[in-house]
Amino acid sequence: LIIGFGISGRHSITVTTVASAGNIGEDGILSCTFEPDIKLSDIVIQWLKEGVLGLVHEFKEGKDELSEQDEMFRGRTAVFADQVIVGNASLRLKNVQLTDAGTYKCYIITSKGKGNANLEYKTGAFSMPEVNVDYNASSETLRCEAPRWFPQPTVVWASQVDQGANFSEVSNTSFELNSENVTMKVVSVLYNVTINNTYSCMIENDIAKATGDIKVTESEIKRRSHLQLLNSKAS
């Protein structure tokens, strides 16, 4: 969480951003909130990116003002117009690119003053893993697959029964480049699986951590997976 304050000469207002990550090829959100104003006419929102000459986005007098927008963001940005009046300056970024990573500044002017805060935006690829029993294998085998990751993640297996066990000797992980030549498909196979146990396939890079769980009993198979973005620090 980054909290910024205003500039001298006018009252300062508090602006708050949250470091976040974007999944390339999908839409992302750069979070920014500020002390709300009661009227829209005086609110100006400017998004800037370090090293980029033009603006990422500008909203003023109740509408987008995109004449100074940098070419790399053309047609890809939007604020939540109905929420500006209540202090939400967050930016929707369409079709996130690897090159969108960097330091952004959310700069706000209202009738009460000015303020700004920086935001670190990471980009990469992350997806939910799915763990299945591999019935084609000669022994009891689990297969963990996740379609899109970048940068290359680490994969670690764990089990509820054998807590702390190292499964690196009985697992095999491969990374297959996807057609767009950036992201990769992750496939990890775990051998010598025992029944009545819960296994977890944990995939992690510096952007996200995802876990796929599978519980195998004689009568049923239960699956669960979740994904968590790392480094969501507020400013």
């Epitope: 829209l40 006419s41 109740g62 509408k63 117009a81």
Partner: antibody, heavy 115, light 107 residues
Framework: QVQLQQPGSVLVRPGASVKLSCKAS????????MNWVKQRPGQGLEWIGG????????EYNEKFKGKATLSVDTSSSTAYMDLSSLTSEDSAVYYC????????WGQGTLVTVSA | DIVMTQSHKFLSTSVGDRVSITCKAS??????VAWYQQKPGQSPELLIS???YRYTGVPDRFTGSGSGTDFTFTISSVQAEDLAVYYC?????????FGAGTQLELK
């Protein structure tokens, strides 16, 4: 669930003053504006003013300057409006409404000015 | 002050009808217009903010459109419970101002 609680009604004498309250519950209190709106019987809505709960900074409709004074007590999550030198023209329902979109409204306080 | 003019004080309709209420601002207010519904003896309720954004939990038969000075609020298929007074309001500049209201009534 956000709720704004206001007293149902109050009877005051001409020339007197009254302090109306609006107690908020169910959400963070200080990060919003609290607006006050007047509605005379059978009439439309008039914005009196608003107060930013975090700082106590306020904005008034010029028409109500000198008539209404807005204040806030963050410890009790309550916004107040003082109405002074009351006349029959001030007899109305007074609503508090939270944030700059007027997303949540209190039930209103009926102020009757009568001798 | 910005004047918000609702051309109809009363609007007669039948259940199932499509009905539109107009509101004109005396100057450009961008999309800073909200619409509220007030039923007899009740507080107003926010339906539409920023001209066209339906507020949380508001049925999708209610829509808003417009920008600049001309705004429209539409109920695609009027239900009995929609009979109420509808107000437009601008939050572009202070003082915040409301239209005089349009009473929706049964024919």
């Amino acid at each position: 669930q956000v709720q704004l609680q206001q007293p149902g009604s109050v009877l005051v004498r001409p020339g007197a003053s009254v302090k109306l309250s609006c107690k908020a519950s169910g959400d963070t209190f200080t990060t919003y504006w609290m607006n006050w709106v007047k509605q005379r019987p059978g009439q439309g809505l008039e914005w009196i003013g608003g107060i930013y709960l975090n700082s106590g900074s306020s904005e008034y409709n010029e028409k109500f300057k000198g008539k209404a004074t807005l204040s806030v007590d963050t410890s009790s999550s309550t916004a107040y409006m003082d109405l002074s030198s009351l006349t029959s023209e001030d007899s109305a329902v007074y609503y508090c409404a939270r944030d700059s979109r007027f997303s949540y409204w209190g039930q209103g306080t009926l102020v009757t000015v009568s001798a | 002050d910005i004047v918000m003019t609702q051309s109809h004080k009363f609007l007669s309709t039948s259940v199932g009808d499509r009905v539109s209420i107009t509101c004109k601002a005396s100057q450009d207010v961008s999309t800073a217009v909200a619409w509220y519904q007030q039923k007899p003896g009740q507080s107003p309720e926010l339906l539409i903010s920023s001209a066209s954004y339906r507020y949380t939990g508001v049925p999708d038969r209610f829509t808003g459109s417009g920008s600049g000075t001309d705004f429209t609020f539409t109920i695609s298929s009027v239900q009995a419970e929609d009979l109420a007074v509808y107000y437009c309001q601008q939050h572009y500049n202070t003082p915040l101002t409301f239209g005089a209201g349009t009473q929706l009534e049964l024919k």
